[in-house]
Structures are given as structure tokens and as C-alpha cells.
Amino acid sequence: APISSHCRLDKSNFQQPYITNRTFMLAKEASLADNNTDVRLIGEKLFHGVSMSERCYLMKQVLNFTLEEVLFPQSDRFQPYMQEVVPFLARLSNRLSTCHIEGDDLHIQRNVQKLKDTVKKLGESGEIKAIGELDLLFMSLRNACI
């Protein structure tokens, strides 16, 4: 398996009750606006074929896509949660900026691309869905990166 380096986050990032709660509240608010319950972004298909040691790198890719293509464009919605959660997630992204995989990451990029394609295909409702799954993103980052 490819070797990942610097793919670690301190557990203290995930032990802040206030921002954790705001992240979950944002996900809940967005999920109320999500009518497409048949499609899931963060689930078994995303992790398929990705070893445990590669998952932080995988989630870094998902986090960066979510920030750049979903949260920044939708930043005026779901206030006041959005204005607090986006900087928090951006800090996590920054801390993972040196997280790389040495070797072939094609299988990871393939899984991430499927997630991106799903969001793009669904348009704005795909973006809402991605925000509604921020709790899953948060938990996946925590489990994979600490």
C-alpha cells in the first residue's frame, strides 16, 4: 500500500464541544432541505478499496472539494452556523496541507471523483446534500486522521 506522510490531526481538533455542535447543527439544517435521500456521498463506496492508513488522505481530498466547491459558494446560507463552521474546516484543511501519499493514489482519486461527479450532477441539491453530510465528513476526518 502507498505510504502516507503527515496525515495526522491532533485529537484536540475534535474535542471542542461548541464547534462540534455547530458542525452537526449545520448538517442537520441542510439535511432538512435535502429531498434526495436515496443518494449518499460519504459511505461505503467512498471508502471501497481504500486501506485504513490511506483514509486521512482520502478525507483530505473530500474536505478540500467540499470547502472549495460547496461551502465557499454556499457561504451565505444556513447562518449563523456556516460562518463558524467554514473557518474551522478551513483550518483542518490547512493542517492537512502536507498530507501526501507516496505512490499510486489512483484508486483514491477515482473514489473522490465519483463523489465530485455526483455533487456536480445534482447541481445545487448536490451541494445541499454535501452540507447535510458534514457530520459524516467530521466523523470520517476524526476517525481517519487522529
Epitope: 452537526f24 439535511s31 432538512l32 459511505g43 485504513m52 492508513s53 457530520d135 459524516l136 466523523m139
Partner: antibody, heavy 119, light 108 residues
Framework: EVQLVQSGAEVKKPGASVKVSCQAS????????IHWVRQTPGQGFEWMGW????????RYAQKFQGWVTMTRDMSNTTAYMELPRLRDDDTAVYYC????????????WGQGTLVTVSS | QSVLTQPPSVSVAPGKTATITCGGN??????VHWYQQRPGQAPVLVIY???DRPSGIPERFSGSRSGNTATLTISRVEAGDEADFYC???????????FGGGTKLTVL
């Protein structure tokens, strides 16, 4: 065939400890979390916690925090759950089960280990 | 005490449809999974992510969710379906797995 095989039934006295094992086969052990869940007639199913076989990291339910210990041995693809200071109400069937992310469905379960606590 | 509410028992005639419900607060952004447990055996996953079916599980088993209620539906019920059924979710706020109290399905 993917399977989780648990150790046999145990009878313990109150105050004693028990260590249940769960041997995995048929898949890459390090790629799935191993959870422990117990089932009692009174409480139904109770999720106890998980161990990440890749790192040895653990997460415990609040009720079992500071009490239960979950470990793993990569060399024999086995996870362990140890409960010290057993009480009568710890009599239960203890199951190990695997999941992909730490919060996904339990797609494979062990056969269960009956632990009876009785004086 | 379980935070997920299931009816203790459901009875159905062979060939008919059985419906088992699971209610809970703030279900909206949780994923519901269903397990079948026959007497003396370990649970088996029959539905996950509300409505997905694992390979090997008959198409007669289906799941759905509306608001704060998830539903497991078993069509064309057979005698071999008799078992206890449990719903389960992951509660992110408490970071723990939660199970329903179980429903005993009796095939008349």
C-alpha cells in the same frame, strides 16, 4: 469466507475479570473497525466501543469508559475485549462485529460469547 | 432505555406483508440499519443506509424512512422470516451506536 470467530462461554464470579477474543479471517483485518456489542434480556443491545486494528486506537461508549479495554493483535488478526470487576448484571452475550468507518452498519458479526457472572 | 422505539411484536400470515417501524428523534440526518436475529444466533444485517440491501438478502426485504420513522417491510412473508428485528443508528452527538428495543416477528 469473511468471518469473526469468538472464544467460548465463560462463567465468572463477581469481581473477577473476563477477556473475550474475536479472530477475523477472510478479509484485510486492518481495514475494518472491530466493535463490541453486548445483549442482555433487560437492556437489549448495548454498543460498548470499537478498536481500530490498524492503529490500536479505541473509542468507548460513555458507560464503559474507564472500565472496558479493547485491544488487538495484528499477528493473529484477533481483537480482544476485557471487562474487569464483573457484576451480576454484566451477564450477557458479548458480540464482536466489524464496520468500515467507525460509524457504519455492522455487516459481519461474531457468533457471540455468553459470559455468566454468578457467585 | 432505548432511544429508538419499536413495537414489541408484529404478527403476519404467510404470504402477506409485514411492516416494522422504528421511531426516534432527529432521524433526519441519521442512517438507519436493520438486523434480523433468529433465536440463539447472531444478528444479520438485512438493510443499511435506510434502504440498501446487502448481497444475499432477498428482495422481499426493503427499507424506507419518512420524517422521524424508519420502516422495514418484508413482503411475501415466509415461516423462516420469524425472528427478532432491531433497528440501529449512529448518534454523532453522543458518538455511540444506538439500538431499538427489538420487534418479534411471528408468522401465523
Amino acid at each position: 469466507e469473511v468471518q469473526l470467530v469468538q472464544s467460548g462461554a465463560e462463567v465468572k464470579k463477581p469481581g473477577a475479570s473476563v477477556k473475550v477474543s474475536c479472530q477475523a479471517s477472510g478479509y484485510t483485518f486492518s481495514d475494518y473497525y472491530i466493535h463490541w456489542v453486548r445483549q442482555t434480556p433487560g437492556q437489549g443491545f448495548e454498543w460498548m466501543g470499537w478498536v481500530n486494528p490498524d492503529t490500536g486506537g479505541t473509542r468507548y461508549a460513555q458507560k464503559f469508559q474507564g472500565w472496558v479495554t479493547m485491544t488487538r493483535d495484528m499477528s493473529n488478526t484477533t481483537a480482544y475485549m476485557e471487562l474487569p470487576r464483573l457484576r451480576d448484571d454484566d451477564t450477557a452475550v458479548y458480540y464482536c462485529a466489524r464496520d468500515l468507518t467507525g460509524f457504519d452498519p455492522f455487516d459481519i458479526w461474531g457468533q457471540g460469547t455468553l459470559v455468566t457472572v454468578s457467585s | 432505555q432505548s432511544v429508538l422505539t419499536q413495537p414489541p411484536s408484529v404478527s403476519v400470515a404467510p404470504g402477506k406483508t409485514a411492516t416494522i417501524t422504528c421511531g426516534g428523534n432527529n432521524f433526519r440526518n441519521k442512517r438507519v440499519h436493520w438486523y434480523q436475529q433468529r433465536p440463539g444466533q447472531a444478528p444479520v444485517l438485512v438493510i443499511y443506509y435506510d434502504s440498501d440491501r446487502p448481497s444475499g438478502i432477498p428482495e422481499r426485504f426493503s427499507g424506507s424512512r419518512s420524517g422521524n420513522t424508519a420502516t422495514l417491510t418484508i413482503s411475501r412473508v415466509e415461516a423462516g422470516d420469524e425472528a427478532d428485528f432491531y433497528c440501529q443508528v449512529w448518534d454523532f452527538l453522543t458518538d455511540s451506536g444506538s439500538f431499538g428495543g427489538g420487534t418479534k416477528l411471528t408468522v401465523l
